[in-house]
């Protein structure tokens, strides 16, 4: 199907010009705006172009058919849907002056929903001011050829089916194509017909394999906890009905009174550890998924979850041990917007006795460790069946403590 434009699993831009013109070159490569989601999959944003307000008015162009191309420097040959249906190739050549005057552009993004039943295309007009004033209709013509190898080069004119796209949100239309499960690996051929103010905009013939365009549902059950070795464990579960393994992008924003940062990581497991967590910080975490071993589209981000750490982090927070054993607690302490250096930390038991300095270890600039040797059985103190171990800054102790059960 060398006359069709293969759809890639990310956003692309369609530019439309009147017929029978000549052009020097297209102005933008590949239609991808600078921040568009790529295969590493970071952030998807489209840049709205600046329009020349002194351009041609639509009223002069009634009943004109604009032939549209995907902006691409290499792709000078632009096969059009209608012409292809009749078995011809139309090469669109456009004068760059006209291009600037009538800069009708659409962002198009298509994907197969995570339930593998619906193929969706979103068509967003970038010519916003104009389409507020005109009746705006979008139709998607599509065909799933029975067996591609035995078909003629182009499907017959009558074989295309048409869906009316829902444009209830102005400037953005949703086109839904039902795809039988058995045909997910087949090549879907389609083209867009956009009508506005009596002007028809028509896309090239596009081809896509739905199975390569799966956009999974967002991961579920995002959960966070501090581990016994002082890391933040983030875990989640894979969305249902996904027929292949996913990779995940996890991003967090760390907001504390001493630093603000955003960081992300791509993993194939459904959990990971964040080390270097800070006391007195909030962590807002989101995760999204994408096919691991082939093309696909990143899911939407999961609903953000927030985890807040205390001003003192003990790890582990509790120890249950037997008489005669040795155990250690670690602590990180933040006080009045400063991380307390580990060499300034002192440890107390039950706020009654200071633990000797000989039992301290400086693990790093900010992590202090205390070790108890050859432990005796805990003596109950009223309703408390444990000893409370406090990490303090000189003579000031935070009200939080670690629990030692012997």
């Amino acid at each position: 199907f060398n006359l069709s434009y293969p759809i890639t699993p990310w956003r692309f831009k369609l530019s439309c010009m009147p017929p029978n013109s000549t052009y020097d070159y297209f102005l933008l490569p590949a239609g991808l705006s600078k921040n568009t989601s790529n295969s590493n999959g970071h952030y998807e944003t489209a840049v709205e172009p600046k329009f020349n307000s002194s351009g041609t008015h639509f009223s002069n162009l009634s009943k004109t058919t604009f032939h549209c191309c995907f902006r691409s420097e290499q792709d000078r040959n632009c096969s059009l849907c209608a012409d292809n249906i009749e078995g011809k190739t139309f090469v669109s050549t456009v004068n760059s002056l006209v291009f600037q005057q009538i800069d009708a552009n659409w962002n198009i993004q298509c994907w197969l929903k995570g339930d593998l039943k619906l193929f969706i295309c979103y068509v967003e007009s970038l010519f916003k001011n104009l389409f507020r004033n005109y009746n705006y209709k979008v139709h998607l013509l599509y065909v799933l050829p029975e067996v591609l190898e035995d078909s003629p080069l182009v499907p017959q004119k009558g074989s295309f089916q048409m869906v009316h796209c829902n444009c209830s949100v102005h400037e953005c239309c949703e086109c839904l194509v039902p795809v039988p499960t058995a045909k997910l690996n087949d090549t879907l051929l389609m083209c867009l017909k956009i009508t506005s103010g009596g002007v028809i905009f028509q896309s090239p013939l596009m081809s896509v394999q739905p199975i390569n365009m799966v956009k999974p549902d967002p991961p579920l059950g995002l959960h966070m906890e501090i581990t016994d070795d002082g890391n933040l464990k983030i875990s989640w579960s894979s969305p249902p009905l996904v027929p292949f393994p996913l990779q995940y992008q996890v991003k967090y924003s760390e907001n504390s009174t001493t630093v603000i940062r955003e960081a992300d990581k791509i993993v194939s497991a459904t959990s990971l550890l964040v080390d270097s967590i800070l006391p007195g910080s909030s962590y807002e975490v989101q995760v999204r998924g994408k096919r691991l071993d082939g093309p696909g589209i990143w899911s939407d981000w999961s609903t953000p979850r927030v985890f807040t750490t205390q001003d003192v982090i003990y790890f582990p927070p509790k120890i249950l041990t037997s008489v005669g054993s040795n155990v250690s607690f670690h602590c990180i302490y933040k006080k009045e917007n400063k991380i307390v250096p580990s060499k300034e930390i002192v440890w107390w038991m039950n706020l009654a006795e200071k633990i000797p300095q000989s039992q301290y270890d400086v693990v790093s600039d900010h992590v202090s460790k205390v070790t108890f040797f050859n432990l005796n059985e805990t003596k109950p103190r009223g309703k408390f069946t444990y000893d409370a171990v406090y990490c303090c800054n000189e003579h000031e102790c935070h009200h939080r403590y670690a629990e030692l059960y012997v």
Epitope: V259, K265, S276, L278, K334, S364, D365
Partner: antibody, heavy 118, light 108 residues
Framework: QVQLQQWGAGLFKPSETLSLTCDVY????????WSWIRQPPGKGLEWIGE???????NYNPSLKSRVIISIDTSKNQFSLKMSSVTAADTAVYYC????????????WGQGTLVTVSS | EIVLTQSPGTLSLSPGERATLSCRAS???????LAWYQQKPGQAPRLLIY???SRATGIPDRFSGSGSGTDFTLTISRLEPEDFAVYYC?????????FGQGTKVEIK
């Protein structure tokens, strides 16, 4: 005492990929973010990005599309790769440890002068 | 991104004098997120001040930082010969973290 020792080639042609590595000696490697910063000759400092021990990254958006910072926890080292270099990438490149709990840089490598020239 | 503008570009002073360096941010920076560095020729920068006013480990008390919002100041109360260098401010409250263009403190 923490020491950062960086190494990598110093001369690149336009469009090549710059590669630098930073070895960390002494102190704790775990529990910190590790960063790259550059300084064009006679100019100010520019933060490139950082990576945590667990592999989370945070990049300067102006360089993000060309930069990959990676970490090898078994060797106590982290690396910078910058693709499609141009003359504008000529600079002294520093690796640095990010102060725990802050966005400051408390230990620095010795710096590597990277020149991009055809 | 937050742009930090340092002034003056060069400060010519004699040992024993007081140096006042300014750093102005293009938008408000919480005082918790501002730092100062010293850099001598051929060397890596050295952290002096973090959180606008806290001295880093081993930094003499003649160095002090102050300010909030968009205006921050580094003061060297009595210049020692080893203090003649370039000084940079840095913000880390908004990504990307950015540095000022530097103030050179030279011997008059």
């Amino acid at each position: 005492q923490v020491q950062l020792q960086q190494w990598g080639a110093g001369l690149f042609k336009p469009s090549e990929t710059l590669s630098l590595t930073c070895d960390v000696y002494g102190g704790s490697f775990r529990g910190y973010y590790w960063s790259w910063i550059r300084q064009p000759p006679g100019k100010g400092l520019e933060w490139i990005g950082e990576i945590s021990y667990s592999g989370f990254t945070n990049y300067n958006p102006s360089l993000k599309s060309r930069v990959i910072i990676s970490i090898d926890t078994s060797k106590n080292q982290f690396s910078l790769k910058m693709s499609s270099v141009t003359a504008a990438d000529t600079a002294v490149y520093y690796c640095a440890r990010v102060t725990y709990g802050y966005g400051t840089f408390d230990y620095w490598g010795q710096g590597t002068l990277v020149t991009v020239s055809s | 991104e937050i742009v930090l503008t340092q002034s003056p570009g060069t400060l010519s002073l004699s040992p024993g004098e007081r140096a006042t360096l300014s750093c102005r941010a293009s938008q408000s920076v919480s005082s918790s997120y501002l730092a100062w560095y010293q850099q001598k020729p051929g060397q890596a920068p050295r952290l002096l001040i973090y959180g606008a006013s806290s001295r880093a480990t081993g930094i003499p008390d003649r160095f002090s930082g102050s300010g909030s919002g968009t205006d921050f100041t580094l003061t060297i109360s009595r210049l020692e010969p080893e203090d003649f260098a370039v000084y940079y401010c840095q913000q880390y409250g908004s990504s990307p973290w950015t540095f000022g263009q530097g103030t050179k403190v030279e011997i008059k």
